[in-house]
Amino acid sequence: AQGKEVVLLDFAAAGGELGWLTHPYGKGWDLMQNIMNDMPIYMYSVCNVMSGDQDNWLRTNWVYRGEAERIFIELKFTVRDCNSFPGGASSCKETFNLYYAESDLDYGTNFQKRLFTKIDTIAPDEITVSSDFEARHVKLNVEERSVGPLTRKGFYLAFQDIGACVALLSVRVYYKKCPELLQGLAHFPETIAGSDAPSLATVAGTCVDHAVVPPGGEEPRMHCAVDGEWLVPIGQCLCQAGYEKVEDACQACSPGFFKFEASESPCLECPEHTLPSPEGATSCECEEGFFRAPQDPASMPCTRPPSAPHYLTAVGMGAKVELRWTPPQDSGGREDIVYSVTCEQCWPESGECGPCEASVRYSEPPHGLTRTSVTVSDLEPHMNYTFTVEARNGVSGLVTSRSFRTASVSINQTEPPKVRLEGRSTTSLSVSWSIPPPQQSRVWKYEVTYRKKGDSNSYNVRRTEGFSVTLDDLAPDTTYLVQVQALTQEGQGAGSKVHEFQTLSPEGSGNLAV
């Protein structure tokens, strides 16, 4: 931003009213009036070029410093070419000197050279030669100097002529300020430019209405340079929640819009399934029946719990059930759906029911499932089971209602026994089997059916309460088809697979375990 100039003294604008002090009095500098463009202009001039050594002083009136630390002095003047005078005037000069003196009071007409300090010798860039002067075409020079730091209440400037032909048309004294500024939603006050050229005055800004320094952000600061320009912005303010930047101000979000934190982003339209927000909203409330999970951003639509798993089937396989389901048709607007499976068993005789989590085995933990199937095993025969599959999402915990579907299945048989050949000889086969422990209490006996392979007319049956049997009196080197079935009080359980076991040939005698 361009510096602002505060004028302390303006000779040209004063219209000859200032009454500056000349020394020696009545000699040297003289106030003159000319007409230019039908307007009177005033100037102080001196032109004692033929008279040898000169020491003519012109002192300004006392200038109140006020808040200035460094002043700038702009001079507009003409200087005549010494060669334009007869004989070149050996004592003629083409420069003059600029001085200043600080004081806390106005000395009036009491002029003392020793109190003045030289600022600089002022030399023209262009001198006015004879031909120009005759054609009334004078060359105007502009020079600027600065002084600082100033510390007293006021000051004088003085111009020393040492034998030049000079006309001083304008003396303007001013200091510079960094102007009041709005930047980055921060207000920086008008600030007096510092006096030391290398240093920059650090100025703290204040956030505009409804703007804040973001958490962890730097407070807004700017640097006011000597020339009145703002430099090096640091930090910024952001419009607070519920407000957005419009030009250099923070404006409340319009109804139906919101902004949930201090940020550079504009207000956003209220998302789906929210109620229309009032002006300046930091969030939009959810419609009835819709919710926000704690981790949901305010920009996300409000969501609701899912509907139940849509299709659910329970396929019984012996003492196992495969549960399969499909995702809810209504996801509630979320993708974080998980499923939980619970189990209830009912005894058909008594109609009594109870949970069965402890007695059954799931193919994977039944809570927080992401897949849409699970196998439940170790089910007891002649028992009715009801499985509940519940769908949940990130907002299900915010409501009491549950979204579930149930499927019932009756287990009418025990799991088929798993059969192994333990040993064999030329005339015998030793067979063992197992079924899941929860089912063993229901088994009364096991029935082992066996026959020669290819002989469909005759078969043999052995019953036992144990888990193994040796089948004797078999033919050597012969394949037998063996099946084991559990017998319960209610009838037959599921039969095992039909296994093919072969007795040893007479050459390979001995009881070999397989």
Epitope: G289, S307, H310, Y311, L312, T313, V315, R324, T326, P327, Q329, D330, T372, S373, R405, A407
Partner: antibody, heavy 118, light 107 residues
């Protein structure tokens, strides 16, 4: 016995509107999701709309979203499909269907024909 | 949306033949596939759901198989009355989509 009977089909000009009805009987209407499925002249089956058992959830494919509205009248056991801004590609036989908790669409109505033509 | 592709628009078979009608899903639908039969002038009828479960009253010559993305409807011994359009449908994720249909013609 589950019965679904559609009505309300007919001929309409592009941009016109039509309301289809489906009278449901033989089951508890509020226990089931209900659907409209259409069959184009090329014999393609397309799902058109869904309404949940309680009526709070509806769903449509992009091809009809904003133009078709499914609704149900629990008192009358009626399912409706309000169709507006009809296009020639909406020409089809419209079926009302219902599912079971374990299987899709075991029950279909006889269909009602909608022809959109200028 | 899940796309179901029935590669044969029509198939010609003789009474007593075994016929396989196939359906391919564009993504995994587990076993959530149904098959429908539509005879001329009638509404579609559910035959199979969950890939292999027969709907009530469906003759056991109709069997379904498959999982993931590849599914088959098998008619073990085609009867004259089986002349119809057969559609597969995935009922795994919404929108529940249908295949383009396979027309079974009797030689």
């Amino acid at each position: 016995e589950v019965q679904l009977v559609e009505s309300g089909g007919g001929s309409v000009k592009p941009g016109g509107s039509l309301k289809l009805s489906c009278a449901a009987s033989g089951f508890t209407f509020t226990d089931h999701y209900m659907y409209w499925v259409r069959q184009t002249p090329e014999k393609r089956l397309e799902w058109v709309a869904t309404i949940s058992d309680g009526g709070s959830f509806t769903s449509y494919p992009d091809s009809v979203k904003g133009r078709f509205t499914i609704s149900r009248d629990i008192a009358k056991n009626n399912l409706y499909l309000q169709m507006s801004s009809l296009k020639s590609e909406d020409t089809a036989m419209y079926y009302c269907t219902r599912d079971e908790s374990d299987r899709p669409f075991p029950y279909w109505g006889q269909g009602t024909l909608v022809t959109v033509s200028s | 949306d899940i796309v179901l592709t029935q590669s044969h628009r029509s198939m010609s078979t003789s009474v007593g033949d075994r016929v396989n009608i196939t359906c391919k899903a564009s993504q995994d639908v587990t076993t959530a596939v149904a098959w429908y039969q539509q005879k001329p002038g009638q509404s579609p009828k559910l035959l199979i759901f969950w890939a292999s479960t027969r709907h009530a009253g469906v003759p056991d010559r109709f069997t379904g198989s498959g999982s993931g993305t590849d599914f088959t409807l098998t008619i073990s011994s085609v009867q004259a009355g089986d002349l119809a359009l057969y559609y597969c449908q995935q009922h795994y994720s919404t929108p529940y989509t249908f295949g383009g249909g396979t027309k079974l013609e009797i030689k």
